[in-house]
């Protein structure tokens, strides 16, 4: 499998809401021992691998902002933590999973990463991120909505797995 | 903050199984993995096997046919059985939260079993 | 199971000095390595994820570095609290496995 990201930059005004999405791609197993973990996180395009790094969004860490599951089953966050910090990461039954951030700040600008791992139990992990970058503004030139940019499709559909 | 602690007895009989509970507090045990590790007294450590939050368990091939791990949720604990201990069984014994793709960021503090007659 | 291999076994050095810290892999682990550090009566304290990232609140004088079958922790300045065991740790496949540890003690 691998994951997609529908749009590899995201232009708001300070204050706005926006909701960052990712989507699993291919065929996903449901088997017993087959389970999902997938997490959102701020990195910065390394020089060895862009997304290797994680650091927090608003102070909540991936193992905060993590979901789990087996397949393609709904689910969501913890509330209470991430909802006071106006954050929530949910996922759906088709694939597509997303963190959406309330109350724009220009701190919160920067590469933001999504991370998918398929547990096979018994035999390994695999895992595959996505990237995309979220700018921002304030002032007479920020859009008075969310400007989203498609990605590529070689790079939505370039994603490192490992 | 996440904890763990261990607990169980410091000492059993060869042949007998080792038992030791992990407790889980301030956090939820309704996720990662919950792992155990060794380290024999002067050694390196090594990984016992995990329990996911989801039931799921995972042994490392050296033990697997004498161990065990279970989870109780509601307690917010997991366990350890290890059946046939021998000398060679004597370790200190870690409990650790281990994140998918991450690393084991949280251990216990380790608690002595010592294996004698 | 991948085997990890770590030298030197002992490492002397002085406060200040620089501490390098090999680890070998038997087969690639691709950047899924891990670096611990256990001073005596404690538990291991994760220090670097996937070869090169810190964790949270450990000092910048740690450092990871390569990728495949060969490692580095290096340590640019010991300070006296960094004299410990330090493990490193590979989770590309199960069964996860640890490295035989390389103490670094005071010269």
């Known amino acids: 499998f691998k994951v997609a990201t529908p749009y590899s930059l995201y232009v708001c005004p300070e204050g706005q809401n926006v909701t960052l999405t990712c989507r699993l791609l291919g065929p996903v197993d449901k088997g017993h021992d087959v389970t999902f973990y997938k997490t959102w996180y701020r990195s910065s395009r390394g020089e060895v691998q862009t997304c290797s790094e994680r650091r927090p969004i608003r102070n909540l860490t991936f193992q905060d902002l993590h979901l789990h599951h087996g397949g393609h089953q709904a689910a969501n966050t913890s509330h209470d933590l991430a909802q006071r910090h106006g954050l929530e990461s949910a996922s759906d039954h088709h694939g597509n999973f997303s963190i959406t951030m309330r109350n724009l700040t220009l701190l919160d600008s920067g590469l933001y990463c999504c991370l998918v791992v398929e547990i096979r139990h018994h035999h390994s992990e695999h895992r595959v991120h996505g990237a995309m970058e979220l700018q921002v503004q304030t002032g007479k030139d920020a859009p008075s909505n969310c400007v989203v940019y498609p990605s590529s499709s070689q790079d939505s559909e370039n994603i490192t797995a490992a | 903050q996440v904890q763990l602690q261990e607990s169980g007895p410091g000492l059993v009989k060869p042949s007998e199984t080792l038992s030791l509970t992990c407790t889980v507090s301030?956090?939820?045990?309704?996720?990662?993995?919950w792992s155990w590790i060794r380290q024999p007294p002067g050694k390196g450590l090594e990984w016992i096997g995990y329990?996911?939050?989801?039931?799921?368990?995972n042994y490392n091939p050296s033990l697997k046919s004498r161990v065990t791990i279970s989870v109780d949720t509601s307690k917010s604990q997991f366990s350890l059985k290890l059946s046939s201990v021998t000398a060679a069984d004597t370790a200190v014994y870690y409990c650790?939260?281990?994140?998918?793709?991450?690393?084991?960021?949280?251990w216990g503090q380790g608690t002595m079993v010592i294996v004698s007659s | 199971e991948i085997v990890l291999t770590q030298s030197p076994a002992t490492l002397s050095l002085s406060p200040g000095e620089r501490a390098t810290l090999s680890c070998r892999a038997s087969?690639?682990?691709?950047?899924?390595l891990a670096w611990y550090q256990q001073k005596p009566g404690q538990a291991p304290r994760l220090l670097i994820y996937?070869?090169?990232n810190r964790a949270t609140g450990i000092p910048a004088r740690f450092s990871g570095s390569g990728s495949g079958t060969d490692f580095t922790l290096t340590i640019s300045s010991l300070e006296p609290e960094d004299f410990a065991v330090y493990y490193c740790?590979?989770?590309?496949?199960?069964?996860?496995?640890f490295g035989g540890g390389t103490k670094v003690e005071i010269k």
């Open positions: 650790a939260r281990d994140i998918p793709a991450f690393a084991f960021d949280i």
């Open positions: 301030g956090g939820s045990i309704s996720s990662y993995y």
């Open positions: 329990i996911y939050y989801s039931g799921s368990t």
């Open positions: 087969q690639s682990v691709n950047y899924y």
């Open positions: 996937d070869a090169f």
């Open positions: 740790q590979q989770r590309i496949s199960w069964p996860l496995t």
